[in-house]
Amino acid sequence: GALPTQGPGRRRQNLDPPVSRVRSVLLDAASGQLRLVDGIHPYAVAWANLTNAIRETGWAYLDLGTNGSYNDSLQAYAAGVVEASVSEELIYMHWMNTMVNYCGPFEYEVGYCEKLKSFLEINLEWMQREMELSQDSPYWHQVRLTLLQLKGLEDSYEGRLTFPTGRFTIKPLGFLLLQIAGDLEDLEQALNKTSTKLSLGSGSCSAIIKLLPGARDLLVAHNTWNSYQNMLRIIKKYQLQFRQGPQEAYPLIAGNNLVFSSYPGTIFSGDDFYILGSGLVTLETTIGNKNPALWKYVQPQGCVLEWIRNIVANRLALDGATWADIFKQFNSGTYNNQWMIVDYKAFIPNGPSPGSRVLTILEQIPGMVVVADKTEDLYKTTYWASYNIPFFEIVFNASGLQDLVAQYGDWFSYTKNPRAQIFQRDQSLVEDMNSMVRLIRYNNFLHDPLSLCEACIPKPNAENAISARSDLNPANGSYPFQALYQRPHGGIDVKVTSFSLAKRMSMLAASGPTWDQLPPFQWSLSPFRSMLHMGQPDLWTFSPISVPWD
């Protein structure tokens, strides 16, 4: 695979990561070099504490901070360095589980891989040029910091600490692949890969924003749908000290403090679910694009891949409208999502609707980004549900979903697909955090009439639920499209926050496939036991935990 140069062997004989590891990156006064030391140093450029509780709770926890007395570029690079340093074993195992053979030595689609490599190289080169031409731009400053953080992560993992001044290169098939996992779903189609990661109709997350009666609270919940091989999870807390621009005169950015659900070696969420110090909670579910005519908009120049635009918007925005304005610039048409931006600063507990700003919805497809304030809708219906189907009619139509409704029926419709109906039926049962966890983990496919698939044999289908369990579909069944097949895929977590929890940068989180109404997932007893799942527990029976930041 494309594991950065020295490959997986470097100092990884012991793959059992320590329960806790604390490291700092120092700027050595005498040599001028960055260096790693154990513990938290008062004058460190960056420091991180990784607590590995994967076997106990299904999560590892990363607490990472940087020091504002150093310039942003140094902070960003050092943040990457220290993250890789404390989580190198987890990074190795996650890479092996998910990416090791992607465009690797045994890849038979060499043509696609060459196209992908070329696309990424041109795109990275274009961004470097833009960064040079727009050195005073807050946007391009944040893009540069994001890429520097990735560079630090990769350098550190490879056992090299060389802070880049001026231009720097990112390997297109190195740890960039871990960042672009979402973008790849669309790049594969845009670049004509024959066997794509994406199954037709495959869901990629459920989410709900629920206004409790009397507006006594506003709960935000997200359930990631992913391959089970991705279940090495880290909840990350970043406390950065970046400025809006490269000079010291610039003010600090709004989103320096953030907590998010993530993966080893990934410097953003990917789920996506963020609690930001700016008072925003940002989350998405993937809507994809089923219209081949739109792939022409996916070009390596003039676009910034979604993972970077996501990071930049989270850092710079103070409200939903600004977040959308930042995010929609340089639309790549990759990782096409419905984004929900909740602004808790605008929410009045026990109060009336402020009319706007509490909820902003953004939908992206190639060549198009549509944004609307949906605060009034939220207060009228008391919830906003998201389930991988575009809300905006123009996006729904342009992305080719009408054809799929014509071909397969209501499963692809916005109002009548199984999750839309389950959310509509059950959202009123949410009255607190625990009932919200129950809803976002809900899967009672064997007994719920809304989980039936009329064209399937058997009819009950584990994909047709808020938290899918596609491993439970029979292998020998008959299904109209791939998403309904048996596969090692489903809802792999839950994250829920509230007005008061978000203020404290906290959440309730559970890791692993749902087992509320179903037998728990166990690798050794599953049809997928031979798949790589290094570092993962065998049996997934974890309860929700309150994220334990000190």
């Epitope: 100092r11 006064a29 005498a30 070099q33 030391v37 513990g39 056992g159």
Partner: antibody, heavy 118, light 107 residues
């Protein structure tokens, strides 16, 4: 538990050579910057040389008084750091300590004595 | 080279006293100063780094202060086991340099 153990000291003729070794354990050696410090009655504690980690290209730094005569090196696979001392002089006599430079020289070995005399 | 001057070679003290060992750098070394304790026949032991931060396990009666060129190691409530030689060291520039030491003795 961090341990540093020096060896290789002894009596050496002026102009002669010797190689000091330091075996380390209890920490991730390849990440560590390692130093040699000597202590002689007349000069007190005197920093001799440093070698940075593999990640920092194993860069070496020397005191002016030993430059060109002493060479610091490391073998990460053995968790050892070495000090090759050539063209030894009487003023090189002293106890040589191997140290790990964490925040500063946070761990020291027990030292090995080098005497340069005819 | 930066010269670290410990002007007092010896200091007399009694158990329970408070004593301050001083060290002066010939140029600005920011807070890149460490203090070490050495007992006869033993190797030096690190007490303080970055001028004022104690290493773990070092009793809180040891306090470091200063920045720039003037640095102090204070031992409050001196114990008999504190009778030793104390060295300051700068690691702001190569070559790293040590003070000549201050020996703490009983009155």
């Amino acid at each position: 538990e961090v341990k540093l153990e020096e060896s290789g000291g002894g009596l050496v003729q002026p102009g002669g050579s010797t190689k000091l070794s330091c075996a380390a354990s209890g920490f991730t050696f390849s990440d560590a910057w390692m130093d040699w410090v000597r202590q002689c009655p007349e000069k007190g504690l005197e920093w001799v040389a440093e070698i940075s980690s593999k990640a920092n290209n194993r860069a070496t730094y020397y005191a002016e008084s030993v430059k060109g005569r002493f060479t610091i090196s490391r073998d990460d696979s053995k968790s050892c750091v070495y000090l090759q001392m050539n063209s030894l002089r009487a003023e090189d006599t002293g106890i040589y300590y191997c140290t790990r430079r964490g925040y500063t020289m946070d761990y020291w070995g027990q030292g090995t004595s080098v005497t340069v005399s005819s | 080279d930066i010269v670290m001057t410990q002007s007092q070679k010896f200091m007399s003290t009694s158990v329970g006293d408070r004593v301050s060992v001083t060290c002066k750098a010939s140029q600005n070394v920011d807070t890149n100063v460490a203090w070490y304790q050495q007992k006869p026949g033993q190797s030096p032991k690190a007490l303080i780094f970055s001028a004022s931060y104690r290493f773990s396990g070092v009793p809180d009666r040891f306090t470091g202060s200063g920045s720039g060129t003037d640095f102090t190691l204070t031992i409050s409530n001196v114990q008999s086991e504190d009778l030793a030689e104390y060295f300051c060291q700068q690691y702001n520039n190569f070559p790293f340099t040590f003070g000549s030491g201050t020996k703490l003795e009983l009155k």
